[in-house]
């Protein structure tokens, strides 16, 4: 089932999926001056069986100048909202995405594709957040959001990432240099903090991501 809404927008942060659940659709969008080839696919679809997942269909763009039409935007399937992701800067590359059963890797780029990819996510999809350049997370840990089905409705969990801007340096001469350790929100060692349900991520990538204390959710 498709998620009704976009993943939450977090100030000064971007999100990215490390792998895409089967059923995810990616619009075949072309950059300005180009359009989908005639009878070309509207979208790519992540499909698969128990052992292998891959993207069905191929996106192909051709120059608009070769046709009378100048249409550049892929028509959206009815009642489907856009799902946008922004490429996040390294070092957020995950461990081998193929190791996640029922998921597809990031599709390779196609010639003359649009600068922004529009995904249609499905229930169970997880996206990870990271502060944009110039901002740092207040808390340490993976900041993720999951599309869940609750009472017949889909919703994204709230990652609670706080990204702060220009750092204030020590205001007093001789103030001790801060320890070089990561930041985050308190996750209970024995019992979880308020929002610490989805905090533990079983990938090396997630372990390196910065997040805030409220990155997790109550069970």
């Amino acid at each position: 089932e498709l998620c009704d809404d976009d993943p939450p927008e977090i100030p000064h942060a971007t999100f990215k999926a490390m792998a895409y659940k089967e059923g995810t659709m990616l619009n075949c969008e072309c950059k300005r001056g180009f359009r989908r080839i005639k009878s070309g696919s509207l979208y790519m679809l992540c499909t698969g069986n128990s052992s292998h997942s891959s993207w069905d269909n191929q996106c192909q763009c051709t120059s608009s100048a070769t046709r009378n039409t100048t249409k550049q935007v892929t028509p959206q399937p009815e009642e489907q909202k856009e799902r946008k992701t922004t490429e996040m800067q390294s070092p957020m590359q995950p461990v081998d995405q193929a190791s996640l059963p029922g998921h597809c890797r990031e599709p390779p780029p196609w010639e003359n594709e649009a600068t922004e990819r529009i995904y249609h996510f499905v229930v169970g999809q997880m996206v990870y957040y990271q502060c944009v350049q110039g901002y740092r997370a207040l808390h340490r840990g993976p900041a993720e959001s999951v599309c869940k089905m609750t009472h017949g409705k889909t919703r994204w969990t709230q990652p609670q990432l706080i990204c702060t801007g220009e750092m204030e340096t020590s205001q007093f001469p001789g103030e001790e240099k801060p320890q070089a350790s990561p930041e985050g929100r308190p996750e209970s060692e024995t019992s979880c903090l308020v929002t610490t349900t989805d905090f533990q991520i079983q990938t090396e990538m997630a372990a390196t991501m910065e997040t805030s204390i409220f990155t997790t959710e109550y069970q």
Partner: antibody, heavy 114, light 111 residues
Framework: EVQLLESGGGLVQPGGSLRLSCAAS????????MHWVRQAPGKGLEWVSV????????YYADSVKGRFTISRDNSKNTLYLQMNSLRAEDTAVYYC???????WGQGTLVTVSS | QSVLTQPPSASGTPGQRVTISCTGS?????????VHWYQQLPGTAPKLLIY???ERPEGVPDRFSGSKSGTSASLAISGLRSEDEADYYC???????????FGGGTKLTVL
């Protein structure tokens, strides 16, 4: 069980100094940003300062900037607030808080009076 | 003066539904930051009541709910009880402060 225990409050004269401590337990202290929030008698909550999980950056309310210093020792699971040049208007219960903040200590009373 | 604006007082009778508003600006609630609500019973430390606009921590009854829209948020308490009599504060991160800002607090009286 998450616990935050403040100490170091007391009576001090204007212009004096105090150092508050907050001992944390029951959670991974080194993973979370920590706050000091204060509450003057009969008044509302006022944020004082925040420190990132690793102590690499700190922010202060304008009312305390240049007088207070927040710090942490992750090896001791302890948060500190060094308060200098104290004024009467700094009189309040000072709370140590973790995260959003979602967990709060019981507070320590600081009274600045001559 | 608080950065987030709350009514100083609210009241209701047992069983009633009361709503407390919280108005911010483009640097906090309007910037997309989550709103959190705290309950402070007399003589005690604040306790997180609602986080991320509408999420309840474990142990908080579903009589408490939150919502957010634009630069404002609200806390609703249904089926009011005498033990709900307390001060309620909203809070949100603020870009200009680089820290959380609190509302001035609303004293809820159960008549």
């Amino acid at each position: 069980e998450v616990q935050l225990l403040e100490s170091g409050g007391g009576l001090v004269q204007p212009g004096g100094s105090l150092r508050l401590s907050c001992a944390a337990s029951g959670f991974t202290f080194s993973s979370y940003g920590m706050h000091w929030v204060r509450q003057a008698p009969g008044k509302g909550l006022e944020w004082v300062s925040v420190i990132s999980y690793d102590g690499s950056y700190k922010y202060y309310a304008d009312s305390v900037k240049g007088r207070f210093t927040i710090s942490r020792d992750n090896s001791k699971n302890t948060l500190y607030l060094q308060m200098n040049s104290l004024r009467a208007e700094d009189t309040a219960v000072y709370y140590c808080a973790a995260g959003v903040p979602d967990y709060w200590g019981q507070g320590t009373l600081v009274t600045v009076s001559s | 003066q608080s950065v987030l604006t709350q009514p100083p007082s609210a009241s209701g009778t047992p069983g009633q539904r009361v709503t407390i508003s919280c108005t911010g600006s483009s640097s906090n609630i309007g910037a997309g930051y989550d709103v959190h609500w705290y309950q402070q019973l007399p003589g005690t430390a604040p306790k997180l009541l609602i986080y991320s606009n509408n999420e309840r921590p474990e142990g908080v009854p579903d009589r408490f709910s939150g919502s957010k829209s634009g630069t404002s948020a609200s806390l609703a308490i249904s089926g009011l009880r005498s033990e709900d009599e307390a001060d309620y504060y909203c809070a949100a991160w603020d870009d200009s402060l680089n820290g959380p800002v609190f509302g001035g607090g609303t004293k809820l009286t159960v008549l």
